[in-house]
């Protein structure tokens, strides 16, 4: 039965040319975490392995960073990054948990951060 | 509890337009983000495209970029699906679904509370 819950960075916008944290935390539950999948929409932007380490896919690689822990940080952002992002845990014993952080990157120079939201 | 009812559907020639309607019940349809979905004969249900409760943040998949456009017009309740350029891969059955609320869109089956019984399209010469 899996009983954890993700809790995210939630909806967030940042201003073009800046960068921005997307950060996912597995709580309520005693499972092992395995690897980390961070995803953008269809896209693999990295992985982080329990034994092995990150690995940024290779067309990320100028624009992506990993850290600060299992998050990752977004540099140099433009408008097409506006879109979902995924954080995958894949744990033992309890399966794949699925975090969703929606990042809006803003032309103007205000950009407000949202609130942190539970997801089950 | 939404009820969702998708309308549109039928047989049309490759290269033809079609264009599919979802309409929603309830009065909070404006802070439901929506996306249309489909799953074709033995294969795996697929998003296509979504969009988000304002209309400002749209989602296509690749196999319908270019071709496919979602739209809502929540004065009635109604989602769409644009659908021009159709091919024989597009043959389907087509389903819109909704969330009660949220940001931006969902591109993710997983993230939808409610579905419809599906209008079938068959793209064929």
């Known amino acids: 039965m899996m009983t954890g819950t993700i809790e995210t960075t939630g909806n967030i916008s940042a201003e073009k040319g800046g960068s921005i944290i997307l950060q996912c935390h597995l709580s309520s539950t005693t499972a092992q975490v395995t690897q980390v999948n961070w995803e953008q929409q269809d896209q693999l932007l990295a992985i982080c392995n329990a034994d092995l380490g990150w690995h940024i896919s290779p067309s990320f690689k100028d624009r992506v960073a990993p850290g600060p822990g299992l998050g990752l940080t977004l540099q140099s952002l433009t408008v097409n990054d506006t879109g979902e992002y995924f954080c995958i845990y894949h744990t033992y014993p309890d399966g794949t948990y699925t975090g969703r952080i929606f990042l809006e990157v803003l032309e103007s120079s205000v950009a407000e951060h949202g609130a942190r939201f539970q997801i089950p | 509890q939404v009820q969702l009812v998708e309308s549109g559907g039928g047989v049309v020639q490759p290269g033809r337009s079609l264009r599919l309607s979802c309409a929603a019940s309830?009065?909070?349809?404006?802070?439901?983000?929506m996306g249309w979905f489909r799953q074709a004969p033995g294969k795996e249900r697929e998003s296509v495209a979504a969009?988000?409760?304002?209309?400002?943040?749209?989602y296509y998949a690749d196999s319908v970029k270019g071709r496919f456009t979602i739209s809502r017009d929540n004065s009635k309740n109604t989602l769409y699906l644009q659908m021009n350029s159709l091919r024989a891969e597009d043959t389907a059955v087509y389903y819109c679904?909704?969330?009660?609320?949220?940001?931006?869109?969902?591109?993710?089956?997983?993230?939808?509370?409610?579905w419809g019984q599906g209008t079938l399209v068959t793209v064929s010469s």
């Open positions: 969009i988000s409760s304002d209309g400002r943040f749209s």
């Open positions: 309830g009065n909070s349809f404006s802070s439901y983000p």
């Open positions: 679904a909704c969330r009660d609320s949220g940001s931006g869109y969902y591109s993710r089956a997983q993230w939808y509370d409610y």
